[in-house]
Interface confidence: medium
């Protein structure tokens, strides 16, 4: 009995579904009463799924697998897994009996995109030509493990004096923190490239220094100039620092957050102590740190709702505040792709092209493009719908008449990640079934 | 247009020393780096250095680092690559570019014409 | 060092036929260019950052790869494309070139 699985891993990004395809070839007058089906992992030989005496003995893995119930007499012998996790990645194996037998392995890569790297300069005042700074570059919940790449404002590569780490969570996710350590110039640019190597997805950030003496007066306090990018569900520094006097005590500080616009405090430390969370218990100061000057807040699990500006007020003798705006994201899943009608298709005929990606923030931008690169703007409809946690399930419809064959491609892009996700279908000019037989 | 015009072919006695010129147009000199790649009769293309105009810095491919200069003159817009010490092997067209794109992407865009340098006895 | 090795060296072909050129790094770059260079001119570039067409360059010609392997393919040659091909890094120091791959009329 021949079985056949594609010979390519299939990717899937965590948190979503993915399809094993596992096709076989019924005969005349199979039934599903003949037919035995067992995927397992093809290394532990784990039981995950199995069809047996006619009927769907469920999942024997978390209960996150399903099979094509409704296609199986048709030989698809597909598994769908869902919520993806990196602990799946590997080779799942599809034993088919019916008289004869049959088994071929899929291999599951799991991955997972990179936040756009933040850029953290230290120290980050009173800076000369000549200075030795250390710039980290961080980027976070990526899976497989990164490639990161540093370069100067004119691509030169920057190899010297760079230390990367890549720590996994409790997930499998990766975060990465690329150390450069440099001695400054009168100017300069410092670029720091994090890639997926399984993706092919560029996540990259840049620091612009520019030495010079700081002024003089009341507290200079000293935000980002740039949003802080935080991915939904991370935890977020939103940096902020002042420069202490020598002899300076906390016993002098008062530190207040707020949110800009409506004034509602965050967090504060008074009188010497920290005076602690007002914003859901989700945020903390650094108090180590807090003599040396750093007074960035520590907001957990990031929401949605959590986007927006946030005013840091430093007062000692003098007084002085900041900004420093938060902007939340989610990646986009890689998008599904459906066909309608999906049968008998022929030159001539209209179809419906469906391009599906989920739960990302903020809105995306929805390009669809023919298989030369040229862009199908005609008759596209694209909506998005917030779910509860303000993430954006994105749906775009192509309406177009078949040529003889072509190409049609959609792309889904998270406009602050600058992330790309994009799928795509090819329709040949026979007549034709979508998706194409295994 | 954009443009690298390089200067005429050169024939010189090993021991000796070499400087070819890259003048350019059509653009500000100030906001990309110009690089020197050579290449000898029949073989591939070899990276010799650069330089950044605006700031004057400049890296060398190791291999050469003790016999090439290179250097630029903001005011004329020109580039200007010494070698020294030349031996035969050095027999090669010398071309200047022009390192374009933006973080983090770049690739050379514009080429000079080349020039011929023959180093003989 | 970062060494980038084409294959094959030399390749026949003939008007019409798709031509891949493979570019082997000895470590991970962070992406690949393509030139092309014809007798006594200057090379030209036709794909930087491993999979973008230059401007002006047709589109027979594509980019792709990551990694430490990176391919340039020629969907349907032309007579113009016969040339050499060579794939260019600088994700660490020196800059280097491949060694080229000469396409010639078979």
């Known amino acids: 009995l021949e079985v056949q699985v594609p010979e390519d891993p299939v990717v899937a990004l965590v948190g979503t579904d993915a399809t094993l395809r596992c096709s076989f070839s019924p005969e005349p007058g199979f039934s599903l009463a003949q037919l035995n089906l067992i995927w397992q992992l093809t290394d532990t030989k784990q039981l995950v799924h199995s069809f047996t005496e006619g009927r769907d003995q469920g999942s024997a893995y978390a209960n996150r697998t399903a099979l094509f119930l409704d296609l199986l007499a048709q030989g698809n012998a597909s598994l769908r897994l869902q919520r993806v996790r990196v602990a799946d990645e590997g080779s799942f194996t599809c034993f088919v009996s019916i008289r004869d037998f049959g088994s071929a392995a899929v291999s599951l890569q799991v991955a997972a995109p990179y936040s756009k790297p933040s850029m953290t300069l230290e120290p980050n005042k009173d800076l000369r030509p000549g200075d030795t700074v250390t710039i980290t570059c961080s980027s976070y919940r990526g899976y497989p493990e990164a490639e990161v790449f540093w370069q100067d404002g004119q691509g030169a590569p920057l190899t010297g004096n760079v230390t990367t780490s890549q720590m996994a969570n409790e997930q499998g996710l990766f975060d990465v923190h690329s150390v450069l350590r440099v001695v400054l110039g009168a100017n300069g640019t410092y670029s720091c490239l994090v890639r997926n190597p399984v993706l092919q997805q560029d996540a990259h950030g840049s620091i612009t220094i520019t030495p010079q003496r700081s002024p003089t007066g009341a507290v200079e306090v000293q935000v980002p100039e740039d949003p802080v990018v935080a991915l939904v569900g991370t935890d977020a520094t939103l940096r902020c620092s002042f420069s202490p006097e020598p002899g300076f005590s906390l016993a002098q500080l008062n530190l207040i957050w707020q949110l800009t616009d409506t004034k509602q405090l965050v967090h504060s430390f008074t009188e010497g102590r920290d005076q602690g969370s007002a914003y859901a218990n989700r945020t903390a100061l650094f108090l180590d740190l807090l003599a040396q000057g750093n007074a960035s807040l520590r907001l957990q699990r990031v929401r949605v709702a959590d986007e927006g500006s946030f005013t840091c007020f430093v007062s000692i003798r003098d007084f002085g505040s900041a900004a420093v705006s938060l902007q939340v994201a989610a990646p986009y899943s890689k998008p599904s792709m459906t066909l309608e009608p999906n049968k008998d298709l022929r030159p001539g005929d209209t179809v419906t092209i469906t391009c599906s990606s989920y739960r990302g923030y903020p809105e995306a931008e929805v390009f669809w493009q023919d298989g030369q690169g040229a862009p199908l703007t005609g008759n596209v409809t694209t909506s998005q719908m917030a779910n509860e946690q303000g993430l954006f399930d994105v749906h775009s419809v192509l309406r177009v008449v078949l040529g003889a064959n072509g190409t049609y491609s959609c792309l889904v892009r998270n406009p602050v990640l600058q992330q790309d996700a994009h799928g795509s279908v090819t329709i040949t000019g026979q007549p034709m079934t979508f998706p194409p037989e295994a | 247009e954009v443009q690298l015009v390089q200067s005429g072919a050169e024939v010189k006695k090993p021991g000796s020393s070499v400087k070819v010129s890259c003048k350019a147009s059509?653009?500000?000199?100030?906001?990309?780096?110009i690089h020197w790649v050579r290449q000898a009769p029949g073989q591939g293309l070899e990276w010799m250095g650069y330089i950044n105009p605006n700031s004057r810095n400049t890296d060398y491919n190791q291999k050469f680092k003790d016999r090439v200069t290179i250097t630029a003159d903001k005011s004329t817009s020109t580039a200007y690559m010494e070698l020294s010490s030349l031996r035969s092997e050095d027999t090669a067209v010398y071309y200047c570019a022009r390192y374009s794109g933006s973080t983090p992407y770049w690739y050379f865009d514009v080429w000079g014409q080349g020039t011929t340098v023959t180093v003989s006895s | 060092d970062i060494q980038l090795t084409q294959s094959p060296s030399f390749l026949s072909a003939s008007v019409g036929d798709r031509v891949t050129i493979t570019c082997r790094a000895s470590s991970s770059v962070s992406y690949m260019n393509w030139y092309q260079q014809k007798p006594g001119k200057a090379p030209k570039l036709l794909i930087y950052?491993?999979?973008n067409l230059a401007s002006g360059v047709p589109s027979r010609f594509s980019g792709s790869g990551s990694g430490t392997e990176f391919t340039l393919t020629i969907s349907s040659l032309q007579p113009e494309d016969f040339a050499t091909y060579y794939c260019q890094q600088w994700s660490s120091n020196p800059l280097t070139f491949g060694q080229g791959t000469k396409l010639e009329i078979k």
């Open positions: 950052a491993t999979s």
């Open positions: 059509g653009y500000s000199f100030t906001s990309y780096t």
